[in-house]
């Protein structure tokens, strides 16, 4: 069978090979399509409701004034010329419809580095056959389930027209320290070959780095935070930000009831001072920023000083602020 592709809504003419150019003709067309139960036979005489769908022209060709999805199928013509020689024509008709240009809807203006983000949803409306949607990053195809890329797809069919609407939702996890302004686009590839892809306008969300680049540092004296009973520990909170933010102190995750200060002195250390300490710098723009916690422990006489002590009681000894 010869493959024929026709655009939905357009006319189609199928030639009946070997048929005399004008009547009288001995020919018949047989159709097996979405409109027929089995094989439907059409003759040059025509007439009836089928004339609006398909009719035989004076030259023996079959004419379909406006091809639809239901016209997909097999078309066969059997003709006899004046000498009684029989010729058969066999066509496999497939129909297509190019959708409108795909669009990216619900697109994000900003993505957060290091976590999954919805980039947007690509929508293509009015295709036949369904076709496929694919995503591109900086012009290169994005492969789902690779490097933090995931795609959720949905295909719907219009109950009356039979045309397809495709949706593809893209989720990505941008790498920290990566491109701050990636370019995403989406393209529709038709289900039938020999038709070029349709591409959306690109989108360029910003990538936001959620982690402050410079840590709040907590410096302990003596180093390691292990001290003999009655000794003094000095904790200093170093914040790179300018202007200097307010610094509060925490012990075992609970704020200490002290005025803000970058230095915390624990004089005459006792068991009640043991625990995990951290400092919190408060910035107006990105809120509180906490240091890593350090462990303060007491070394009993004769013990080696550990590099990190165990968490002790929750009471507070005498505190001094520099």
């Amino acid at each position: 069978a010869q493959n024929i592709t026709a655009r939905i809504g357009e006319p189609l003419v199928l030639k009946c090979k070997g048929a005399p150019k004008k009547p009288p003709q001995r020919l018949e067309w047989k159709l097996n399509t979405g409109r027929t139960e089995a094989w439907k036979v059409l003759s040059p005489q025509g007439g009836g409701p089928w004339d609006s769908v398909a009719r035989v022209l004076p030259n023996g060709s079959l004419f379909l004034p406006a091809v639809g999805i239901q016209d997909e199928g097999i078309f066969r013509c059997q003709a006899m010329n004046r000498n009684g020689k029989e010729t058969k024509s066999n066509y496999r008709v497939r129909v297509y419809q190019i959708p409108g240009k795909p669009e990216i809807v619900d697109s994000a203006s900003e993505l957060t580095a290091g976590v999954p983000n919805k980039v947007g949803t690509c929508v293509s409306e009015g295709s036949y056959p369904a076709g496929t949607l694919s995503w591109h990053l900086d012009g290169k195809p994005l492969v789902p389930n690779e490097k933090g890329v995931s795609v959720k797809e949905q295909t719907r069919r219009h109950p009356e027209t039979g045309l397809f609407t495709l949706q593809s939702e893209l989720m990505v996890t941008p790498a920290r320290g990566g491109d701050p302004r990636p370019t995403f686009s989406c393209s529709f590839s038709p289900g039938l070959p020999r038709h070029r892809a349709l591409r959306t306008a690109p989108i360029q969300p910003r990538v936001w780095e959620p982690v402050p680049l410079e840590e709040v540092q907590l410096v302990v004296e003596p180093e390691g935070g292990a001290v003999a009973p009655g000794g003094t520990v000095t904790l200093t909170c170093e914040v790179p930000a300018q202007p200097s933010p307010q610094i509060h102190w925490m012990k075992d995750g609970v704020p200490l009831p002290l005025p803000p200060s970058p230095v915390l002195i624990l004089p005459e250390i006792g068991p009640q001072d043991q625990g995990t300490y951290s400092c919190v710098a408060t910035h107006s723009s990105h809120g509180p920023q906490e240091s890593r916690a350090v462990s303060i422990s007491i070394i009993e006489p004769g013990e080696e000083g550990p590099t990190a002590g165990s968490v002790g009681g929750s009471g507070l000894g005498t505190l001094a602020l520099a």
Partner: nanobody
């Protein structure tokens, strides 16, 4: 992995209230600090509020102090942001966030839109 899913956003008149919820699931033991940030169209993302999971401390941006309250429900594994006396300038996408400590948030939700009309 920790998953954060925000809900409760919507359209509200100036002076009205909304309560945002952030459902926390996954490896929640790896997080101790939770917060809310927001981003208005064309503006930088900004801090709104943060708290310890145990409720021992909480922080608020100056712009929302006295109007917004952060809280949590341990049984439901949910963090809330109650927003009262809303103003048009509170219009933004609100993001829930979580991390080991304040300021270092490894996990972010997808955001929920809050629109305050005048």
């Amino acid at each position: 992995e920790v998953q954060l899913v925000e809900s409760g956003g919507g359209l509200v008149q100036a002076g009205g209230s909304l309560r945002l919820s952030c459902a926390v699931s996954g490896r929640t033991f790896s997080t101790d600090a939770f917060g809310w940030f927001r981003q208005a169209p064309g503006k930088e993302r900004e801090f709104v509020s943060a708290m310890r999971w145990n409720g021992s401390s909480s922080y608020y941006a100056d712009l929302v102090k006295g109007r917004f309250t952060i809280s949590r429900d341990n049984a439901k594994n949910t963090v809330y942001l109650l927003m009262n006396s809303l103003k048009p300038e509170d219009t933004a996408v609100y993001y829930c966030t979580a991390g080991k400590r304040y300021g270092y948030y490894d996990y972010w939700g997808q955001g929920t839109q809050v629109t305050v009309s005048s």
